[in-house]
Interface confidence: low
C-alpha cells in the first residue's frame, strides 16, 4: 500500500481542503472511525487500484486516525494497513469528543491504561488531574492517544489552555472490576399467566460487576420492544439483575424468553431461556386416570389421589354422596392438596381405618373463577371373608348335610373339601375337593345374598353327603380378593354312636 502524503502525522489548516491518496495491487479503501467516508475508487491501466479521499472545509473534528486498507473480505496482514494521523488545530474545539463508553475505563487487574483525552493541536500543553484536585499528575501524554499509565479507582480530567482560556475535558472514571466466568439464572414470577396479567422475568448474574443484558422474546420479533430494568441486589455482592416486565400479556406473548449476558472484558457470555405460556383463561385439567371404581379394605387406611394441572391456583373440595368433606377432628379423614410444581397439584383423601359406612360416591372438585373439573368414583369397601357357621345335620332322608355360612366383600367363593384318612390328613394327603357335579356322592347348593346395610355378601352353602361309611373331615373354605377363612367339621356315619 502506498499513501500520499505518507504521514505518519499531518497538521492541516482549518477550513482548508486536502486530498489523501492510497494505492495498491488490490482494491483499497479509506477508513475513518470504523466507517468508510465518501471517496473515489479507480483502477489504472497498469492494474493498480487507488482511492482518493478529499477532505473539504476541515475543522478540528476531522482530527484523528485515518486508515487505508485492502477492500476485500479476506483477513489481511497488519502491514497491509496504513495509518495516518491528522491534526487540524482549531481554537473552537477544546478536547475531541468521546463516546460515552470511553469515559468509563474498566480494569480487571493492575495494568497500564490510557485516558483518551485528545486535542486538535499537537503544540498544546495538556495536563492530567484528579477531578477534585489542581495538581497535575506526572503521567506521560501522547497527543494522538492521551495519558497512559497505571491509575487508581478515581475520576480524572484533562486540562489545556487555548489562547487565554483554560479548557477542561469531560471526566474519566476508572473502575477496577470483579470479573469471573458468567453464571446466569433466569426465572419468572409465573411461567403461566392469563391474558391481561403481567409477565415478569428476572435474569441474575453472579460474580460480575459490569455485564450487558440482552433479552429476546416473542414481542421483540414483531418490533414491539420492552425496556428491561437493571439493578444490583444490594444485599448480595456482585449480583446484577435485569428485569423484563410485560404488563397486560397477550396470547402472542407465549414463547421462549432468552436472557443473553455478555461481559466484554474477558469476552465471556452465557444465556438461559425460559418458556412462558399465556392462556386465554385459566384452566383445570385432570392428569392421568382414576378408575370409576376404587377399593379400600375394611379397617385399613386408604389414600385416594388425584393429580391435576391448574392455573390460577384452584380451590379443591371433596364430596361424599354430595356432602362436603373436611378434615375430621376424630382423625378419620385427612384431606390435603399440595402444589408439586408451578401448575401441578396432587389432592389426596386419606380414609383412616376404613369403615363400611365410608363406601359410596366420592367426588373431587377443583375450581377457580375461570374453570372447574370434577372427578368421581365409587368406593367399595372390601371386607375379608369370615366363616360364621359350619354345622352338620342328619335329615330323615338318610343323607347327611353340612351347612357353611360366611360373609365378605367382594363376593366370596366357597370351596368344599374332605379327607377320609383322619390320621394322615391334611399333612400327608391332600384333601379331596367336593361338590363337583360329576360326583354322585355329594351335592352342593349355594345361595348368595347382598346385605345393603352392611355392604357385603353372605354365602350359604349346603353340602349333601349321600352315604358316609367312615368318619370324614369336611372343610369349608371361603375366599375373596382380600382373604380366606376355613373351618372344619368331622362327619361320622349314622351307624356310629359318637361324634368327634
Amino acid at each position: 500500500l502506498v499513501v500520499t502524503p505518507p504521514g505518519p502525522e499531518l497538521v492541516l489548516n482549518v477550513s482548508s481542503t486536502f486530498v489523501l491518496t492510497c494505492s495498491g495491487s488490490a482494491p483499497v479503501v479509506w477508513e475513518r472511525m470504523s466507517q468508510e467516508p465518501p471517496q473515489e475508487m479507480a483502477k489504472a491501466q497498469d492494474g493498480t487500484f487507488s482511492s482518493v479521499l478529499t477532505l473539504t472545509n476541515l475543522t478540528g473534528l476531522d482530527t484523528g486516525e485515518y486508515f487505508c486498507t485492502h477492500n476485500d473480505s479476506r483477513g489481511l496482514e497488519t502491514d497491509e494497513r496504513k495509518r495516518l494521523y491528522i491534526f487540524v488545530p482549531d481554537p473552537t474545539v477544546g478536547f475531541l469528543p468521546n463516546d460515552a463508553e470511553e469515559l468509563f475505563i474498566f480494569l480487571t487487574e493492575i495494568t497500564e491504561i490510557t485516558i483518551p483525552c485528545r486535542v486538535t493541536d499537537p503544540q498544546l500543553v495538556v495536563t492530567l488531574h484528579e477531578k477534585k484536585g489542581d495538581v497535575a499528575l506526572p503521567v506521560p501524554y501522547d497527543h494522538q492517544r492521551g495519558f497512559s499509565g497505571i491509575f487508581e479507582d478515581r475520576s480524572y480530567i484533562c486540562k489545556t489552555t487555548i489562547g487565554d482560556r483554560e479548557v477542561d475535558s469531560d471526566a474519566y472514571y476508572v473502575y477496577r472490576l470483579q470479573v469471573s466466568s458468567i453464571n446466569v439464572s433466569v426465572n419468572a414470577v409465573q411461567t403461566v399467566v392469563r391474558q391481561g396479567e403481567n409477565i415478569t422475568l428476572m435474569c441474575i448474574v453472579i460474580g460480575n460487576e459490569v455485564v450487558n443484558f440482552e433479552w429476546t422474546y416473542p414481542r421483540k420479533e414483531s418490533g414491539r420492544l420492552v425496556e428491561p430494568v437493571t439493578d444490583f441486589l444490594l444485599d448480595m455482592p456482585y449480583h446484577i439483575r435485569s428485569i423484563l416486565h410485560i404488563p397486560s400479556a397477550e396470547l402472542e406473548d407465549s414463547g421462549t424468553y432468552t436472557c443473553n449476558v455478555t461481559e466484554s472484558v474477558n469476552d465471556h457470555q452465557d444465556e438461559k431461556a425460559i418458556n412462558i405460556t399465556v392462556v386465554e383463561s385459566g384452566y383445570v385439567r385432570l392428569l392421568g386416570e382414576v378408575g370409576t371404581l376404587q377399593f379400600a379394605e375394611l379397617h385399613r387406611s386408604r389414600t385416594l389421589q388425584v393429580v391435576f394441572e391448574a392455573y390460577p391456583p384452584p380451590t379443591v373440595l371433596w364430596f361424599k354422596d354430595n356432602r362436603t368433606l373436611g378434615d375430621s377432628s376424630a382423625g378419620e379423614i385427612a384431606l390435603s392438596t399440595r402444589n408439586v410444581s408451578e401448575t401441578r397439584y396432587v389432592s389426596e383423601l386419606t380414609l383412616v381405618r376404613v369403615k363400611v359406612a365410608e363406601a359410596g360416591h366420592y367426588t373431587m372438585r377443583a375450581f377457580h373463577e375461570d374453570a372447574e373439573v370434577q372427578l368421581s368414583f365409587q368406593l367399595q369397601i372390601n371386607v375379608p371373608v369370615r366363616v360364621l357357621e359350619l354345622s352338620e345335620s342328619h335329615p330323615d332322608s338318610g343323607e347327611q348335610t353340612v351347612r357353611c355360612r360366611g360373609r365378605g366383600m367382594p363376593q366370596p367363593n366357597i370351596i368344599w373339601s374332605a379327607c377320609r384318612d383322619l390320621k394322615r390328613c391334611p399333612r400327608e394327603l391332600p384333601p379331596t375337593l367336593l361338590g363337583n357335579s360329576s360326583e354322585e356322592e355329594s351335592q352342593l347348593e349355594t345361595n348368595v345374598t347382598y346385605w345393603e346395610e352392611e355392604q357385603e355378601f353372605e354365602v350359604v352353602s349346603t353340602l349333601r353327603l349321600q352315604h358316609v361309611d367312615r368318619p370324614l373331615s369336611v372343610r369349608c373354605t371361603l375366599r375373596n380378593a382380600v382373604g380366606q377363612d376355613t373351618q372344619e367339621v368331622i362327619v361320622v356315619p349314622h351307624s356310629l354312636p359318637f361324634k368327634v
Epitope: 385459566g282 384452566y283 385432570l286 367426588t363 375450581f367 368421581s376
Partner: antibody, heavy 121, light 113 residues
Framework: QLQLQESGPGLVKPSETLSLTCIVS??????????WGWIRQPPGKGLEWIGS???????FYNPSLKSRVTISVDTSKNQFSLTLTSVTAADTAVFYC?????????????WGQGTLVTVSS | DIVMTQSPESLAVSLGERATINCKSS????????????LAWYQLKPGQPPNLLIY???TRESGVPDRFSGSGSGTDFTLTIGSLQAEDVAVYYC?????????FGPGTKVDIK
C-alpha cells in the same frame, strides 16, 4: 366447526337395550377441556340429563337412570356411546348428545340435532 | 337432587314487548368461593337442538342477541327478552350445573300475542 351427530335405531322393543352413538367431528373427543354428555326429552316433556363422560373413561350418571345406563368412549373413532337397558315406553324420547366444558363456564355449549327413539312392540 | 321450577308455564307477548321468565332452584346455586351462580338458560325451537343463551346466570353466550339478558342470584333467576322478535318463539329452559345430577326446569313456552 364442531359437530355432533347421534345415530342408532329409531325403534326399540320394550325390555330390550337401546344403543346410540354420537360421532364428533371438527374437534377431538380426547380434548382435556370437555365432558361429553347425553340428554333426552320425552315427547311433550322437559329435558333430562342422562350422564356425562370424560375421554379417559370417567363417567357421571343421573342416579334415576344409573342402574340401566352405560356411557363409553372410543377415542380412536372420535365417538362416544349410550346404552340404556330394559327400556319401557317411558324411555321414548329425543336423545341429544352434547358437549360441556370441564371448565364449567359453558354448560352444554354444543348439541347434536337429536334422534327420536320410540320404545314400542 | 336440585329441583328447578319455572314460571309461567307459557306466556304470549306482543312483538317488540318485553318477556320475562322466572326460574327457581330448590337450593342455592351460588358458590360463595367464586361468587358465581351455576345457572344456564337454553332456547329450544321445534326440530332444533337446544341453544345455550346465558351461563353464570347473566353472561351471554357469544353470538346471542343482546335483547336476551339474565339476572338473579342464589335461588331466584330471571331471563328477560327485551324486545320480542318473531324468531324468539320457542320453549326456554333453565338448568343448574352446580352439582350432579344436572337438572333442567320444566320449560316456559313463549308465543306471540
Amino acid at each position: 366447526q364442531l359437530q355432533l351427530q347421534e345415530s342408532g335405531p329409531g325403534l326399540v322393543k320394550p325390555s330390550e337395550t337401546l344403543s346410540l352413538t354420537c360421532i364428533v367431528s371438527g374437534g377431538s373427543i380426547s380434548s382435556s377441556s370437555y365432558y361429553w354428555g347425553w340428554i333426552r326429552q320425552p315427547p311433550g316433556k322437559g329435558l333430562e340429563w342422562i350422564g356425562s363422560l370424560y375421554y379417559s373413561g370417567i363417567t357421571f350418571y343421573n342416579p334415576s337412570l344409573k342402574s340401566r345406563v352405560t356411557i363409553s368412549v372410543d377415542t380412536s373413532k372420535n365417538q362416544f356411546s349410550l346404552t340404556l337397558t330394559s327400556v319401557t315406553a317411558a324411555d321414548t324420547a329425543v336423545f341429544y348428545c352434547a358437549r360441556h366444558r370441564v371448565m364449567a363456564s359453558s354448560p352444554f355449549d354444543h348439541w347434536g340435532q337429536g334422534t327420536l327413539v320410540t320404545v314400542s312392540s | 337432587d336440585i329441583v328447578m321450577t319455572q314460571s309461567p308455564e307459557s306466556l304470549a307477548v306482543s312483538l317488540g314487548e318485553r318477556a320475562t321468565i322466572n326460574c327457581k332452584s330448590s337450593q342455592s346455586i351460588l358458590y360463595s368461593s367464586n361468587n358465581k351462580n351455576y345457572l344456564a338458560w337454553y332456547q329450544l325451537k321445534p326440530g332444533q337442538p337446544p341453544n345455550l343463551l346465558i351461563y353464570w346466570a347473566s353472561t351471554r353466550e357469544s353470538g346471542v342477541p343482546d335483547r336476551f339478558s339474565g339476572s338473579g342470584s342464589g335461588t331466584d333467576f330471571t331471563l328477560t327478552i327485551g324486545s320480542l322478535q318473531a324468531e324468539d318463539v320457542a320453549v326456554y329452559y333453565c338448568q343448574q350445573y352446580y352439582s350432579t345430577p344436572f337438572t333442567f326446569g320444566p320449560g316456559t313456552k313463549v308465543d306471540i300475542k
